[in-house]
Interface confidence: low
């Protein structure tokens, strides 16, 4: 067969589904290979092919889009399932085509089963929220496409196993799940039952997504060194290990990038010639307040790495800060014969 | 940042042709798709056609079919138009526009290339 | 082909007022895929907003767009002394793609 321009398996969209529920797939040629729509191509006289490989097995083969009921059907360039059946799982793929030009991607697609309480395999997306930031909404999400505007679904939620109801400060509203005040208590699965008719039948959506309760900005601060501080001093003889932690405090922030790194004399460690091994440790609060340390480690310290300066800095989206370390020579303990004997006057 | 630099104005005779190019700088050429536009004096917008450096097959206008010819050179990243059998009413600005990195729509426009009909 | 009707032609307007501009589309637009460009006097169109809505990368907030199938609207909210330009919508789900004829926003 002629060439085609294969962008291979795209693992990074690991499609998972419900079973006995509708999924509508997007050819991922437009979303993130080629970066024109389908109408582009559509219009330019390409023809967008479907075919599939069943799990377990190698050989590809067409899509039936000739089930009862429009089983699975194909619109522009999405790929329908009303609904998936658990033997769909396998990989697609979508091939743009004409005389001239050939390009192609396949896709994992999954379906899942899943509990009376919600639980299955399938990978959650996670909604942070800020704690007692005031009321904060969550969207049912990923339902978008599947009904037109006229159609008005019913939309059930729950927490875990249960229908959220008279429950104290989390209210469903349609689409939306509102938090009045956001706690730890709230952490957890939640999931929206999406309900619709179409053409005669009835389909439901399951999303479940996590909720976890993050630091609030309200409470956020620039990032607080713990150590170095005044209070020690790193004392060594030439020889000996050097051993400084800078341990860092940072305040949740979203899609803050929280850093820390040790200068020696204005200069990173990489790019000096002292034999220096720096380990990081990460630790998390329940709101995801983070603690780093970075542990600057010297095996046999000279007496000028000992006059050197050593700054640790810290910075998030709330700002920069830096502490030097105290470092020192150990002076000697007195030799009593020679100091002693100086002492009295002997020469 | 993706800039697309055209060539410079041309003045040229009825029954004649031109060729307008469109160099695309700074970014990733064949996957997006490079339209023409062209503005008569005074005048508003009208869409030529375009092509996808990575197709290579034109679409145009039925207006400009068989008098366009649009084309790319993806080692050069470079788009081209040619009209031919001109007349005095294609005396206009021609635009290159480039079809979408975060859209569908012409997000990235040429500076334009003046196109003068004279006897 | 899609014909888009711009209307009013001209809209005469002072600075800080609100301008309404309107686009009439002949079939309903695919996709909701129509734009809005600004061109000023010897400069290439502008992109403003795509996808009947979406503001582009850089525009101000003050440009809004409305509207679905036939009947689309853009909107400046307060008109600043660099929005008096010429305004096209385009609708770009169907080929031919096609403009209106344009509606220029001039100083009162």
């Known amino acids: 067969s002629e060439r085609c321009d294969d962008w291979g398996l795209d693992t990074m969209r690991q499609i998972q589904v419900f079973e006995d529920e509708p999924a509508r797939i997007k050819c991922p040629l437009f979303e993130h290979f080629l970066k024109f729509n389908y109408s582009t191509a559509h219009s330019a006289g390409l023809t967008l092919i479907w075919y599939w490989t069943r799990q377990d097995r190698d050989l590809e083969e067409p899509i039936n889009f000739r089930l009862p009921e429009n089983r699975i059907s194909k619109e522009k360039d999405v790929l329908w399932f009303r609904p998936t059946l658990l033997n769909d799982t396998g990989n697609y793929t979508c091939m743009l085509r004409n005389t001239t030009y050939c390009s192609k991607v396949a896709f994992p697609l999954e379906v899942v089963q899943k509990d009376s309480c919600f639980n299955s395999p399938m990978k959650l997306p996670v909604h942070k929220l800020y704690i007692e930031y005031g009321i904060q909404r969550i969207t049912c999400p990923n339902v978008d496409g599947y009904f037109p505007s006229s159609v008005k679904p019913t939309i059930t939620w729950y927490m875990g196993c249960y229908k959220i109801q008279n429950f104290n400060n989390v209210i469903p509203e349609g689409m939306n799940l509102s938090f009045l005040i956001a706690l730890i208590s709230n952490n957890g699965n939640y999931t929206c039952v999406v309900t619709y008719p179409e053409n005669g039948r009835t389909f439901h959506l399951t999303r479940t997504l996590t909720v976890k309760v993050v630091g609030s900005p309200k409470n956020a601060v620039p990032p607080v060194i713990h150590s170095p501080n005044d209070h020690v001093v790193y004392e060594k003889e030439p020889g000996e290990e050097l051993l400084i932690p800078c341990t860092v405090y940072f305040s949740f922030l979203m899609d803050s990038r929280n850093e820390v790194w040790w200068t020696i004399d204005g200069k990173k460690p990489d790019d000096i010639t002292i034999d220096v091994t720096i380990n990081e440790s990460i630790s998390h609060s329940r709101t995801e307040d983070e603690t780093r340390t970075q542990i600057l480690s010297i095996k046999k310290v000279t007496s000028e790495d000992l006059k050197r300066s050593y700054v640790c800095h810290a910075r998030s989206a709330k700002g920069e800060v830096a502490k030097a370390a105290k470092v020192k020579q150990k002076v000697p303990a007195p030799r009593y014969t020679v100091e002693l004997a100086c002492g009295f006057g002997a020469t | 940042q993706v800039q697309l630099l055209q060539s410079g104005a041309e003045v040229k005779k009825p029954g004649s042709s031109v060729k307008v190019s469109c160099k695309a700088s700074?970014?990733?050429?064949?996957?997006?798709?490079i339209d023409w536009v062209r503005q008569a004096p005074g005048q508003g917008l009208e869409w030529m056609g375009g092509?996808?450096?990575?197709?290579?097959?034109?679409n145009s206008a039925q207006k400009f079919q068989g008098r366009v010819t649009i084309t790319a050179d993806k080692s050069t990243s470079t788009a081209y138009m040619e009209l031919s059998s001109l007349r005095s009413e294609d005396t206009a600005v021609y635009y290159c526009?480039?079809?979408?990195?975060?859209?569908?729509?012409?997000?990235?426009w040429g500076q334009g290339t003046m196109v003068t009909v004279s006897s | 082909e899609i014909v888009l009707t711009q209307s009013p032609g001209t809209l005469s307007l002072s600075p800080g007022e609100r301008a309404t501009l309107s686009c009439r589309a002949s079939?309903?637009?695919?996709?909701?895929?129509l734009a809005w460009f600004q061109q000023r006097p010897g400069q290439a169109p502008r992109l403003l907003i795509y996808?009947?809505?979406r503001r582009a990368t850089g525009i101000p907030d003050r440009f809004s767009g409305s509207g679905s199938g036939t009947d689309f609207t853009l909107t400046i909210s307060r008109l600043e002394p660099e929005d008096f330009a010429v305004y096209y919508c385009?609708?770009?789900?169907?080929?031919?793609?096609?403009f209106g004829g344009g509606t220029k926003v001039e100083i009162k």
């Open positions: 700074g970014g990733t050429f064949s996957i997006y798709a």
């Open positions: 385009q609708q770009y789900g169907s080929s031919p793609l096609t």
């Open positions: 079939l309903s637009v695919s996709s909701n895929y």
């Open positions: 526009a480039r079809n979408g990195a975060t859209s569908d729509a012409f997000d990235m």
């Open positions: 092509i996808i450096p990575i197709f290579g097959t034109a």
């Open positions: 996808g009947v809505s």
